[in-house]
């Protein structure tokens, strides 16, 4: 589910004029195609460069993919009467580099936000909570997707990436109730210690295609609700044993862990002996080592003990300049 | 050294099955991914699949699920591919190769002819 | 599944020229790519792993590069020897699928 999906309707799409006089609730927005049958509303690839004023009271589901939005200000979605039917909204695509604090707010029943393909350079702490109470009241979304939502290197903050989502992502303890997030393809190096605990309803979890190295400072433990948790194509060596019982003890997970540099070394040997035993990792006899040379695809659960070694480091007077 | 050798050139008819073997040298069989791949004039390399032999897994390109079967013995270090129906189209050298992320190391191909 | 495209089907070239081989993927492949050669007679070889790593045994002529959806190999100072087909393959996604060969032939 990484995308904002509508019902299926016979009813055909009305694309809309321009037109002088003021919106009627359920007009269509020029640039759009609107169907009320299915609540759907698409204004796609279109060049937008903000959210249309005058979308239809019924809308539930809302495509704004493929524009040049650049900023989501406060209230980008407020109306009055309020958009209470919105649900799914998809902004994937639309050249978006800052989403300011309460951009989603008067949101009520919004329970999809697809923010992905955009280059966020500023994500406000703020986006999701709406304020910048230390609790603030819960956010309504249940899946939140922001995969490749890195900017370019020139286009950074100073502050890591990696600080500046998870900030939006625990800020007034707003997502409490999400049960999906995906923050595939970030370049993520770390997953910042605290975040996790914020969200304790997770399902499912994407974090592959980065290039997360450790999952040493990170706890799974309390996410008891977790059902898929996908590690793909990282840069992970190896998974101590503080993370194989955190994950052993989740009661539903399945842990995807293909395509990462798997270092078959003595310290390998923990996690050989969890993966012989362990009904949590899925496709578990595909995963190989990359390193070092001489173990290059070997197959991590047909390892024992005696081919996991670590070179001894010599004393100083052995060592040789 | 790995060294892998593969069985004969064949010459079936259509309609037939065979089975060509890959028996490997030098390296701990059950170890690693053993893969098999298809070469004809003018459509390169396919990869039909792989077996994990101490355990039996198996992966299939969808293209060949039907067609090719893999075992492996590990007693003796052999890798079995059993390809069936054979037509015209089965015409190709087919190779296994040491597996996993890359292939390391392949054997040197068995000629199979399918002709009436 | 995951296509390799290999744009230049044969290419010819003199002894010592430097040859660059390219390959495209139809999605990004995070650098999971592996090249080989298959010599006239039918023997095949692995030359470079994860884009960039040199198989043992390789001569350092062979170099290798890229990453999103665009790869090459690169052949510094061609000798007789390198005569044959180059493959591209990706092992992102099974099935693990090749590119259609480059020839490389002398001049």
């Known amino acids: 589910t990484s995308s904002a999906s509508s019902s299926s309707s016979s009813a055909p799409f009305l694309a809309s004029a321009a037109s002088a006089q003021p919106p009627l609730p359920d007009q269509c927005p020029a640039l759009c195609e609107c169907s009320e049958a299915a609540r759907t509303v698409k204004c796609v690839n279109r060049n937008l460069t903000e959210v249309p004023t005058d979308l239809p009271l019924y809308v539930r589901n809302l495509f704004l993919t493929g524009n040049q939005l650049a900023v989501l200000p406060a209230g980008a979605f407020a109306r009055r009467p309020p958009l209470a039917e919105l649900a799914a909204l998809n902004l994937s695509g639309s050249r978006l580099d800052e989403v300011r604090g309460g951009a989603f707010e008067h949101l009520p029943s919004l329970r999809q936000l697809d923010l992905s393909h955009n280059p966020l350079a500023y994500l406000s702490p703020f986006a999701f909570s709406g304020s910048n109470a230390s609790i603030s009241a819960p956010s309504p979304l249940v899946e939140l997707i922001l995969n490749h939502i890195v900017p370019p290197d020139d286009k950074r903050q100073n502050r890591s990436f990696e600080g500046m989502v998870a900030a939006a992502l625990v800020a007034g303890r707003a997502l409490q109730g999400l049960h999906l997030l995906e923050l595939a393809s970030n370049h993520f190096l770390y997953l910042p210690r605290d975040v996790l605990a914020q969200l304790p309803s997770l399902r499912y979890l994407d974090l592959s295609n980065n290039s997360l190295v450790s999952l040493t400072y990170v706890s799974f433990r309390n996410l008891t609700h977790l059902e898929s948790l996908h590690l793909e194509d990282n840069a992970l060596k190896v998974l101590h044993n503080g993370t194989l019982a955190e994950l052993q003890g989740l009661p539903h997970v399945r842990v995807f862990l293909d395509n990462n540099p798997w270092v078959c070394d003595c310290h390998m040997a923990d996690m050989v002996t969890w993966l012989k035993q362990t009904g949590v990792v899925q496709g578990k006899d595909r995963l190989t080592c990359a390193f070092p040379e001489k173990m290059r695809n070997r197959v991590l659960l047909e390892l024992n003990s005696a081919d996991l070694d670590c070179d001894p480091i010599l004393p100083p007077s052995l060592q040789t300049s | 050294q790995v060294q892998l050798q593969q069985s004969g050139a064949e010459l079936m008819k259509p309609g037939a099955s065979m089975r060509l073997s890959c028996k490997a040298t030098g390296y701990t069989f059950t170890g690693y991914w053993l893969e098999w791949i298809k070469r004809r004039p003018g459509h390169g390399l396919e990869w039909i699949g792989e077996i994990l032999p101490g355990r039996g897994s198996t992966n299939y390109n969808e293209k060949f699920k039907g067609k090719a079967t893999f075992t492996a013995e590990t007693s003796s270090n052999t890798a079995y591919m059993q390809l069936t129906s054979l037509t015209t189209e089965d015409s190709a050298i087919y190779y296994c190769a040491r597996g996993g992320r890359d292939f390391d190391n392949w054997g040197q191909g068995t000629t199979l002819t399918v002709s009436s | 599944d995951i296509q390799m495209t290999q744009s230049t089907s044969s290419l010819s070239a003199s002894l010592g020229d430097r040859v660059t081989i390219s390959c495209s993927a139809s999605?990004?492949?995070?650098?999971?790519l592996n090249w080989y050669q298959q010599k006239p007679d039918g023997t095949v070889k692995l030359l470079i792993y994860y884009t960039s790593s040199l198989h043992s045994g390789v001569p350092s002529r062979f170099s290798g590069s890229g990453s999103g959806t665009d790869y090459s190999l690169t052949i510094s100072n061609l000798e007789p020897e390198d005569i044959a087909i180059y493959y591209c393959?990706?092992?992102?996604?099974?099935?693990?699928?090749f590119g259609g060969g480059t020839k490389v032939e002398m001049k």
């Open positions: 999605q990004g492949i995070n650098n999971h």
């Open positions: 393959q990706q092992f992102s996604k099974l099935p693990y699928t």
